[in-house]
């Protein structure tokens, strides 16, 4: 049972006023949070581009049982004095399981330090916990970043598990469907855990597939034939 009741869910609305939250940090002081550079969303290597360690755990209204994975937030702090007051963008990659406020970001050491004045990163981290302001923003990944579909380990012609990542705009995914080449019917994948979607089917899935993903704001995007014929498990495929 959370010590503090969560705030209302943060939805895909933008340009809103700043909201108050508490912030802490975990992991290595200049690291990306989890020891294994992962997190509850299922993303790996969050220390590397495009997340580049600007990552964090959100509590229930932010993580939303995995639905918040990939969403982006501007965060800033004004106190203590080491705070720059300038907003930085963080990506939700993990679940904050022990919230201390209705909205609580448990940030990577790197992201926490990024709110500091230049040279004061360690000073800010030594505060440990602080008040911050946040608002949902559209995700803008570095140019050349492609939406990536990771076919999870164990996937086979009767079972396909997909992790969708690096989605511009809303960032988070609320529905995933696939369509086999030459067929008209979309097959709906079911949400599993983290940001992984899956389908179990008695009919063999051979590929190539077009993947359609829907973000929280309702935008549907199709990645045509992104998963090729002869696709392999534990392999990532980039949209064209």
């Amino acid at each position: 049972i959370p010590k503090v009741p969560p705030g209302p869910n943060i939805t895909a609305t933008y340009g809103d006023k700043w909201l108050d939250a508490k912030s802490t940090w975990y992991g290595k002081p200049t690291g990306a949070g989890p020891k294994d550079n992962g997190g509850a969303c299922g993303y790996k290597d969050v220390d590397k581009p495009p997340f580049s360690g600007m990552t964090g755990c959100g509590n229930t209204p932010i993580f939303k049982s995995g639905r918040g994975c990939g969403s982006c937030f501007e965060i800033k702090c004004t106190k203590p004095e080491a705070c720059s007051g300038e907003p930085v963008v963080v990506h939700i990659t993990d679940d904050n399981e022990e919230p201390i406020a209705p909205y609580h970001f448990d940030l990577s050491g790197h992201a926490f330090g990024a709110m500091a004045k230049k040279g004061d990163e360690q000073k800010l981290r030594s505060a440990g916990e602080l008040e911050l302001q946040f608002r949902r923003v559209k995700c803008k990944y570095p140019e050349g970043t492609k939406v990536t579909f990771h076919v999870e380990k164990g996937s086979n012609p009767n079972y396909l598990a997909l992790l969708v990542k690096y989605v511009n705009g809303d960032g988070d995914v609320v529905a995933v469907d696939i369509k086999e080449k030459g067929k008209d019917k979309w097959i709906e994948l079911k949400e599993s855990w983290g940001a992984i979607w899956r389908i179990d089917t008695p009919d063999k899935l051979t590929g190539p597939f077009t993947v359609r993903y829907t973000t929280e704001g309702g935008t549907k995007t199709e990645a045509e034939d992104v998963i090729p014929e002869g696709w392999k498990a534990d392999t990532s495929y980039e949209s064209k």
């Epitope: 992962g38 509850a40 790996k44 049982s65 079972y159 599993s192 855990w193 992984i196 179990d200």
Partner: antibody, heavy 116, light 107 residues
Framework: ESGGGWVQPGRSLRLSCSAS????????MHWVRQAPGKGLEWVSG????????AYADSVKGRFTISRDNGKNSLYLQMNSLRPEDTALYYC??????????????WGQGVLVTVSS | ELVMTQSPSSLSASEGDRVTITCRAS??????LNWYQQKPGRAPKLLIH???TLQDGVPSRFSGSGSGTEFTLTISGLQSEDFATYYC?????????FGGGTTVDVK
């Protein structure tokens, strides 16, 4: 499984589960508990590569699941233990690697008793 | 969280009887439903996964059916070794949840 025993409320325990006879990193793993005379309660699960970890609401923020594929081992770090955590704790192997599906192999269970 | 409701909670039967146990999900779980058998002092054993697929080595007198929210485990021709407690469990989403169990004992 190992690491069980009697502990006072508020204290910590770490459970371990060592697997043999299977390719450990091909499967998701779970902890399931059973209070004396009661039914089964899923506690936590972890995907093959630790990419996803999930918890029951009753243990969220207190328990941490982890695995070491090199040692074929699964762990459950239990902090801030409560009397209601008293149970037989089973480690269980999933049929799948990346998503939860069905638990086809179970350990013999390890007893955790929390009381003052 | 998804609530799994099992009925009955207990039943008495004789060898050779046909036994039916029902499991209801609070919302659709498609066919992500498993059945386990547990005997006193033993770990649970997987009988059926994906609502109707018999696990290797499980006798064919066990069968499962249903999809969506309503599921059934049937034992056709109860044997002495089948007196045990049976649990359903959904794996559609986390937290994974079990039904409360059905104990099958000797009439």
């Amino acid at each position: 499984e190992s690491g069980g025993g009697w502990v006072q409320p508020g204290r910590s325990l770490r459970l371990s589960c060592s697997a043999s006879g299977l390719t450990f990193d091909d499967y998701a793993m779970h902890w399931v508990r059973q209070a004396p005379g009661k039914g089964l309660e899923w506690v936590s699960g972890i995907s093959w590569n630790s990419g996803v970890r999930a918890y029951a609401d009753s243990v969220k923020g207190r328990f941490t699941i982890s695995r070491d594929n090199g040692k074929n081992s699964l762990y459950l770090q239990m902090n801030s233990l409560r009397p209601e955590d008293t149970a037989l704790y089973y480690c269980a192997k999933d049929i799948r690697a990346a998503t939860p599906y069905a638990l086809d192999h179970w350990g013999q269970g390890v007893l955790v008793t929390v009381s003052s | 969280e998804l609530v799994m409701t099992q009925s009955p909670s207990s039943l008495s039967a004789s060898e050779g009887d046909r036994v039916t146990i029902t499991c209801r999900a609070s919302r659709t779980i498609y066919n992500y439903l498993n059945w386990y058998q547990q005997k006193p002092g033993r770990a649970p054993k997987l009988l059926i996964h994906a609502a109707s697929t018999l696990q290797d080595g499980v006798p064919s007198r066990f069968s499962g059916s249903g999809s969506g929210t309503e599921f059934t485990l049937t034992i056709s021709g109860l044997q002495s070794e089948d007196f045990a407690t049976y649990y359903c469990q959904q794996s559609h989403g986390t937290p994974l949840t079990f039904g409360g169990g059905t104990t099958v004992d000797v009439k």
